[in-house]
Interface confidence: medium
């Protein structure tokens, strides 16, 4: 697994698909729909948690349509998360035993329908803008995830948060290191394929401690982190440490020296 | 919205212990990462410590690790912290926070905060 120790540690392809039209919803602005599991555990949010977990993340939780849209687009994942309606839902691209759902050996977006909602599942969240920009930050010694909240702050950012992480892949962000986000999870976007970077498909990797995909990584161990500066908070072309300007697409990489 | 109300401080003598309890208000408790900070008289206020809406993940101020120890329960909307070898220095009103994500030492990043309870360490 890129840029991890641990031989503990799992990965999800997690692949997530650019929305950008849906049919029968022309003005849906252009985004990515996103599963998300914070927590260690899974299915551990009821309708209530599971939209404050959206926000809380920079985004919100995704309509059916735009759950649909990324299905037709490619989206695929095996794992039950409400939407915005109090449905329950996920998109099968390949049938297989353990993701039939509703639909037997068919493609499709299973439901489970409208679920009471104290019922606990995950949650499909929808981002469609990053109002900044995502950094990717490294030091020899790597951190702690306290050490990756103070070394974001000190360069006047914080942990980016899972949601402006997935805005930032969508916009270009490519990175074969995992790092701390704001959720304590570790997770790293992929936009070109390779072999030693997990998986055949673009998407965000997610690093699991355990192989069922369930599991936050030793908040003690040491990694790299990706930071987000807000947009009143970016610095002007050339201001950054160094001379380097700012991407104009608000996505950067920045490999920070210091100690 | 989410109201915090802090209870627990009062006078103790150095070596001590305190274990101070912040009840939050309204249902989504759990979405919350919540932090404890700190306001000495004449100072600005300072962290303490924190700790993730699931408790994965707690953090501390390097003069309070080892000695205070932060956690929740969610099932009570409540946050506490333990406090033991309380020394003269940790004489402060101390502050409950709360934020949508674990947003570090910054004060100005939490979105939520309580009226503080007053801690006296002295002999």
């Known amino acids: 697994t890129p840029g991890l120790g641990p031989a503990t540690a799992f990965t999800s392809e997690d692949l997530v698909v650019q929305v950008t039209a849906v049919p029968g919803q022309p003005h849906l602005p252009g985004g990515v729909v996103f599963h998300y599991r914070p927590g260690p555990t899974r299915y551990s949010l009821t309708f209530e948690e599971a939209q404050q977990a959206c926000l809380r993340t920079g985004a919100v939780i995704a309509s059916p349509e735009q759950l649909q849209a990324a299905y037709e687009a490619g989206y695929e994942q095996c794992d039950a998360g409400w939407l915005r309606d109090q449905t329950v839902r996920y998109p099968i691209v390949s049938p297989r035993t353990p993701c039939v759902g509703d639909k037997d050996s068919s493609p499709g977006v299973r439901t489970y329908g409208v679920r009471p909602s104290t019922e606990t599942y995950d949650v499909y969240c929808f981002v469609d803008r990053l109002e900044g920009e995502v950094f990717f930050a490294t030091r020899l010694e790597q951190f702690t995830f306290q050490e990756a909240l103070e070394f974001c702050e000190s360069h006047n950012a914080t942990l980016a948060t899972t949601g402006q992480l997935y805005a930032a892949w969508s916009r270009g962000l490519d990175k074969c290191y995992a790092g701390w986000l704001a959720d304590g999870s570790l997770r790293y976007p992929i936009v070109t394929p390779r072999p030693a970077c997990g998986g055949d498909k673009p998407g965000v990797r997610t690093v699991y401690l355990y192989p069922n995909q369930t599991g936050l990584p030793d908040p003690l161990s040491r990694h790299h982190a990706f930071c987000f500066r807000g947009i009143s908070a970016v610095p002007s072309p050339g201001e950054e440490e160094g001379g380097t300007p700012t991407s104009p697409s608000g996505v950067e990489e920045w490999i920070v020296t210091q100690v | 919205d989410v109201q915090l109300v802090e209870s627990g401080g009062g006078l103790v003598q150095p070596g001590g212990s305190l274990r101070l309890s912040c009840v939050a208000s309204?249902?989504?408790?759990?979405?919350?990462?919540m932090g404890w900070f700190r306001q000495a008289p004449g100072k600005e206020r300072e962290f303490v410590a924190a700790?993730?809406?699931?408790?994965?993940?707690?953090y501390y101020a390097d003069s309070v690790k080892g000695r205070f120890t932060i956690s929740r329960d969610n099932s009570k909307n409540t946050v506490y912290l333990q406090m033991n070898s309380l020394r003269p220095e940790d004489t402060a009103v101390y502050y409950c926070?709360?934020?949508?994500?674990?947003?570090?030492?910054?004060?100005?990043?939490?979105?939520?905060w309580g009226q503080g309870t007053l801690v006296t360490v002295s002999s």
């Open positions: 700790i993730t809406w699931s408790s994965a993940t707690t």
């Open positions: 926070a709360a934020a949508r994500i674990p947003v570090g030492r910054r004060s100005e990043n939490w979105d939520y």
């Open positions: 309204g249902r989504t408790f759990s979405s919350y990462a």
